[in-house]
């Protein structure tokens, strides 16, 4: 059969039926529906809202709908024995103490189960002593203390900045620099645009707010006690101190009007440039400790907080391919929030929700997708993106081989600028061709297209007349499919104007503010985004999984894999010497590169050219474009990161959130004019050198006329 | 618009015990610390106790300590302050404030609202 | 304890005119600090936070400066109204809150 056979619709029809379906207000019904109460991972409160999809997605017309349930390590507050931080007085007493929770938003007063902030998966502890202010924590923050200012962390309690990079990275540099406590604040500077309100009267950050997040450094090994296995009913746990990426020093959240009270006291050194202040009224002083009159006072944190093996639940469901049943094209978000989740992540669950209800109709109208569409409903992702490693970990042998791509869908927006997009470089075209055919929601581009009012208000760097597409980093749900398996992923959400607001995220990110009202009220009354992101979701979705040749283009990833070879080249070329003494030659990866490029190309005339009549050739030109992003995958993975295997995107070793390219070699290279064995250090650049070289020819030969 | 309303006052005895209460409407109470501020006949203000709107912070001046206690009920929008072993130099008029804090373009400590005050006598 | 002090305790103005009352703390305060009025029988108003911020409402006429341990309050052209006790105070080092003694304004 082919895929017009698999439809009574007209098939230039499918698509724009399926996009016509697609209803705003749809959306902010569902938004409403999923917001009014906390749906915490391994809550009753999150079970139940799963069972709720569940249903309503087998009313949409899905196949079949089933829960997939797991027993992960998660965190939570001690509910008698809060969480907190005090300024202690040489006798001991507490002067001051930060709050227990955030005033809660009009409306939600007698809400109940609003978990207090905390970092998920602190330990327990009490420690006592001087602040000292690290900026945002990242590691040049760290060399900037420890190598130009001579101030030593050892011993002391650090207070982080939120912002530029993961918290999880923030708390790893904190303990690899000796302290013994941290605490993560919200700085004004990055989480209040000037000229807004705070909440409820606007969608700025109140002086009470804070954001909550986990502080895993799990490098893409899911529930902590089960890496590379699915945490199921006879599961083999590792003990807690055996456990993968848990901090080992307590870590808690506040908001900047305790910070405040905590900072204002400071003394020490003065901060070392302007880079180091927010905005507060404070001097922004490193410490350690308080100055002058404040000597004698101390910082002391109270952490109580357990972590406990809980059950979570992922829905999955089924839309069967009627010609390529054993090919899946993924589209998945998760259903668990910190708080109400107005934003993180039910923007996104509507979306989904609003997205399976209109290909359900479609399938009731007698309507099949060329291949099997799976929506994933997952859970925990605020845990450390639990639910879907573990489905995957359960799944990988099947994914792996019939893994079409993966379209992420968490937050529809963390602004209502213009839209974003991070992907694999084989679905640059599809990006682009659907955003052509979509209409721009944007003030000034009526009657434009999304594509226009994206490429002026965000242009590529690097190609006049082209949007910007950023790499895929992780912090979210196609880590494990991308990162692991090698499976093409995407994801799209609207954003925010970067040049104008430099704050971090979206001012109430992780709050308690994060509510339906914040949406309907301050981001998108009129829900236009969410319908623009259900459309470029779902339609991504729908061409991945209705098109008859796959729409990934090779010759996209031949570009972006010269453009990664320059970049990491001319970081080695900041050593000059070295790599002369080392004998240390870019060659092979320039020539490997060099030949993708050329195999690519051909593969790309023999795509136009071939018979789509014939479905055993048509299948094999697909299954080489769909195991081309396989082919990146080494499977010993990364140094010390052993499910971050794609050797050409990693997460950054310095920022989870960002992805770095040629990620080995970049690795090897930083700092390592510190290193104090530099044959050893230059001998695995080469070494990763090696690596790069022979995926990239690999990958092309798989590129190759098969016979 | 903002309300802050004092009752409570009186003639007492000294060494015998008062409640003050401040009833408090026109704004989210939930989120705000409240204070209380007496002010003798005739004399300057003294700041007597805050309460932090979460009761994670509970102060007094060194004058009461140990006498008054600050507290709040956030479901009935009150602020109380529990008067005990009054002395004659307690004798004033005690208002309840609320501070302004809230967000990064507001000061913390800072009354911005004042309620009319009630008058507490301590007198044989 | 911060001791904040005030100067004059009280003075005499005519209507139109400008005064200027100070305000010294004991020890720097950065910009954490208050002015309020009060007048007879009432509460307290918040005119001035945070040394210089106008509180919404206030006519443009009172403004604040300073900075670390000396302060002023500036009434430019006084209207009928403005005869009242003035007051500093410090949020700085709390707690204790701790007030000036109070400035009185006067009709000459």
């Known amino acids: 059969k082919s895929s017009n056979e698999a439809t009574n619709i007209t098939p230039k029809h499918n698509m724009k039926a399926f996009l016509d379906e697609l209803k705003a207000e749809n959306i902010k019904k569902f938004l409403y529906n999923f917001t009014q109460i906390p749906h915490l991972a391994g809550t009753e409160q999150n079970f139940q809202l799963a069972k709720q999809i569940q249903s309503q997605w087998k009313e949409f017309g899905l196949d079949s709908v089933e829960l997939a349930h797991y027993d992960v390590l998660l965190s939570y507050p001690n509910k008698t024995h809060p969480n907190y931080i005090s300024i202690i007085n040489e006798d001991g007493n507490e002067i001051f103490n930060t709050s227990l929770f955030e005033p809660p938003p009009p409306g939600y007063e007698n809400v109940s189960d609003i978990v207090p902030p905390f970092s998920a998966f602190s330990p327990q502890g009490m420690p006592e002593g001087d602040l000292v202010y690290v900026n945002y924590a990242r590691t040049e923050d760290f060399f900037k203390l420890e190598r130009d200012m001579k101030i030593n962390c050892s011993g002391k309690i650090v207070i982080a900045r939120y912002g530029k990079v993961f918290r999880g990275n923030k708390v790893k540099n904190a303990q690899l620099a000796g302290a013994k406590g941290v605490i993560l604040y919200s700085d004004p500077a990055d989480y209040f645009a000037p000229g807004v309100k705070s909440y409820p009267d606007g969608w700025n950050l109140p002086g009470g707010g804070v954001q909550r997040g986990n502080i895993l450094n799990l490098n893409g090994a899911g529930d902590p006690l089960t890496p590379g296995y699915p945490a199921n009913e006879y599961a083999y746990r590792r003990g807690i101190a055996e456990a993968v990426g848990l901090p080992s020093i307590p870590v808690h959240p506040i908001g900047y009007y305790d910070a405040q009270k905590l900072l204002e006291k400071m003394g020490g050194s003065a901060p070392p440039d302007s880079s180091w202040r927010g905005s507060l009224k404070v001097p922004y002083n490193v410490g350690p400790g308080f100055t002058g009159n404040f000597s004698t006072q101390k910082v002391k944190m109270h952490i109580h907080s357990t972590n406990e093996v809980t059950r979570i639940y992922n829905v999955i469901g089924t839309l069967r391919g009627a010609v390529e049943p054993d090919r899946y094209v993924i589209l998945g978000g998760h259903r668990d929030s910190w708080v109400f989740g107005g934003i993180d992540p039910q923007s996104g669950a509507a979306v989904v929700h609003e997205i399976v209800r209109s290909f359900g109709t479609l399938k009731k109208e007698g309507w099949r997708p060329r291949r099997t569409i799976l929506f994933a409903s997952w859970d925990a992702e605020e845990f450390g993106l639990l639910g879907s490693t573990e489905w995957a970990e359960e799944n990988s042998r099947l994914l792996q081989e019939r893994g079409v791509a993966y379209i992420n869908a968490d937050s529809s927006i963390e602004g209502n600028y213009t839209l974003r997009v991070d992907c694999t470089p084989l679905m640059y075209s599809l990006v682009h061709n659907l955003t052509k055919e979509l209409k721009s929601p944007d003030e000034g581009f009526e009657g434009k297209s999304l594509y226009e009012s994206w490429t002026k208000k965000s242009p590529s760097p690097e190609f006049s007349g082209m949007p910007r597409i950023s790499k895929l980093g992780s912090g979210n749900d196609f880590e494990v499919f991308f990162q692991r398996l090698g499976i093409a992923s995407g994801r799209a959400r609207y954003t925010k104007n970067w040049e104008t607001n430099k704050f971090s995220g979206y001012p109430l990110y992780h709050s308690v503010y994060e509510t339906y009202e914040l949406v309907e009220k301050f981001y998108d009354p009129m829900f236009k985004y969410h319908l623009t992101v259900a459309q470029v979701r779902g339609g991504m979705v729908f061409e991945l999984a209705n098109s008859i040749v796959l729409p990934f283009d090779c010759r996209d990833y031949a570009v972006v894999l010269r453009k990664y070879a320059d970049k990491i080249y001319s970081i080695s070329m900041k050593h000059p010497q070295e790599m002369k003494t080392y004998s240390v030659s870019f060659d092979s990866l320039f020539s490997a590169v060099k030949n993708f490029t050329e195999i690519a190309s051909k593969f790309s005339e023999r795509l136009q050219d071939f018979d789509k009549s014939n479905p055993i050739v048509l299948r094999m030109m697909n299954d080489q474009l769909m195991f081309l992003e396989r082919a990146f995958i080494d499977p010993l993975g990364l140094p010390d990161r052993p499910f971050y295997r794609h050797v050409i995107y990693a997460p950054s070793s310095h920022n989870k959130y960002a992805g770095e390219s040629f990620p080995g070699i970049y690795d090897a290279l930083f700092d390592i004019e510190s290193k104090v064995d530099p044959s050893k250090a230059w001998g695995e650049v080469k070494r990763q050198i090696y690596v790069a070289a022979f995926t990239v020819q690999a990958a092309a030969e798989t590129l190759s006329e098969v016979a | 618009q903002v309300q802050l309303v004092e009752s409570g006052g009186g003639v007492v005895q000294p060494g015998r015990s008062l409640r003050l209460s401040c009833a408090a409407s026109g704004f989210t109470f939930r989120s705000y610390g409240m204070h209380w501020v007496r002010q003798a006949p005739g004399k300057g203000l003294e700041w007597v106790a805050f309460i932090s709107y979460d009761e994670s912070n509970k102060h007094q001046a060194d004058s009461v300590k140990g006498r008054f206690t600050i507290s709040r009920d956030n479901s009935k929008n009150t602020l109380y302050l529990q008067m005990n072993s009054l002395r004659a130099e307690d004798t004033a008029v005690y208002f309840c404030?609320?501070?302004?804090?809230?967000?990064?373009?507001?000061?913390?400590?800072?009354?911005?609202?004042w309620g009319q005050g009630t008058l507490v006598t301590v007198s044989s | 304890d911060i001791q904040m002090t005030q100067s004059p305790s009280s003075l005499s103005a005519s209507v139109g005119d400008s005064v200027t009352i100070t305000c010294r703390a004991s020890?720097?305060?950065?910009?954490?600090l208050n002015w309020y009025q009060q007048k007879p029988g009432k509460a307290p108003k918040l005119l001035i936070y945070?040394?210089?911020s106008l509180l919404s409402g206030v006519p443009s006429r009172f403004s604040g400066s300073g900075s670390g341990t000396d302060f002023t309050l500036t009434i430019s052209g006084l209207h009928p109204e403005d005869f009242a006790t003035y007051f500093c105070q410090q949020s700085f080092s709390t707690p204790p809150i701790t007030f000036g003694q109070g400035t009185r304004l006067d009709i000459k």
């Open positions: 404030a609320k501070d302004q804090y809230y967000d990064f373009l507001t000061a913390y400590d800072t009354l911005d609202y």
């Open positions: 945070t040394a210089s």
């Open positions: 020890q720097s305060i950065n910009n954490y």
